[in-house]
């Protein structure tokens, strides 16, 4: 049985910077996860690996190690940051993200995260993926769940 539940809550903040010469966008995206331990003993969150995709291209990856211990029947909220780069064949996005005439420069990103937990030598991996709106035109702090993008057709399995 799935004894550990991972829920991707959403984007917490996105901080943006630009390289004008390279027509490159740098987005530091902080995400929030809720990890619930339904066991009657503590489990260790060994690592979190995350990646962000834009238009089916991976634009950022991150890995956190030895994160925390979650007590029995407890939940912890964990934030993790993925540095992303929109450049090269996607440099056309630079114009959109820096266009002054638009107030909100939302782009749709796919957030993928895998949480590895361990207990008594046993490892368990749980993965989630979600589409999210992120504003690439300014620094933004989101209410949790505010950035969810629901109207995207999920790719066929």
């Amino acid at each position: 049985p799935r004894s550990i539940d991972v829920k991707y809550i959403g984007v917490k903040s996105a901080y943006v910077s630009y390289d004008v010469q390279k027509r490159t966008i740098y987005l530091n995206i902080t995400n929030t996860l809720n990890i619930t331990n339904n066991n009657y003993y503590s489990v260790e969150v060994e690592n979190i690996t995350a990646q962000v995709q834009f238009s089916k291209t991976v634009i950022g990856k991150a890995r956190l190690n030895n994160i925390t211990i979650i007590g029995p029947l407890d939940m912890k909220q964990i934030d993790y940051t993925v540095p992303t780069v929109i450049a090269e064949e996607m440099s056309y996005m630079y114009d959109f993200c820096t266009l002054i005439s638009i107030k909100v420069h939302n782009i749709v990103l796919m957030m993928q995260v895998t949480v590895t937990t361990t207990y008594f030598g046993h490892s368990e991996q749980i993965s989630q993926e979600r589409y999210q709106y992120v504003d690439c035109g300014r620094n933004t702090t989101y209410q949790l769940g505010q950035s969810e993008y629901l109207n995207v057709l999920q790719p066929q399995q």
Epitope: P1, R2, Y40, Y41, S42, G71, P72, L73, D74, F120
Partner: antibody, heavy 121, light 111 residues
Amino acid sequence: EVQLQQSGPELVKPGASVKMSCKASGYTFTNYVMHWLKQKPGQGLEWIAHITPHNDGTKYNEKFKGKATLTSDRSSSTAYMELNSLTSEDSAIYYCARSGQFGRGDYFHYWGQGTTVTVSS
Amino acid sequence: DIVLTQSPASLAVSLGQRATISCRASKSVSTSGSIYIHWYQQKPGQPPKLLIYLTSNLESGVPARFSGSGSGTDFTLNIHPVEEEDAATYYCQHSGELPWTFGGGARLEIK
């Protein structure tokens, strides 16, 4: 070696309260749930409640709500159960027991030796 | 609450023979593919001792003559061959949902 050492027998008057203890050793106290169970003489077992010592979260059997109160002391790795408004129906052996470590671990892997409570005037 | 009914309430089995104890649940104790039925042995003046967890898993240090089986709402503890030291009361317990409950017990006597 995991050990659960319970406090000694109690003889109490009807209407009074009693607080018993269960001292854990041989493992990290906050890493497991502690349960309390009741066994009347010559009868079966009843689950009363459990406590998660790392945050003092409790879950009670509806039957024992208002009767039993669970607490813990992390500094001494000790769990406590207080029973109030005692009647002859509360005369029993009370066990503390620790969860197992497989899957959801919701069975009773290690047991204390039991605390006998006798309610008599 | 889930009620567990054990039968027989007492049994007498000859040394070396098979003892079979049944435990019937008033509703399913399965959750997410696991069956949350466990078996304990209790001798006079002692706390219960875990024998079998999750229907059929033998607890470490418990002799292989103990075995558990079952599905749905019907479960069985088998002891074969029975030895003198197996004289005790046996309880089934479920943890499918709160509150966890026990069967009424089955007292095994060795003939």
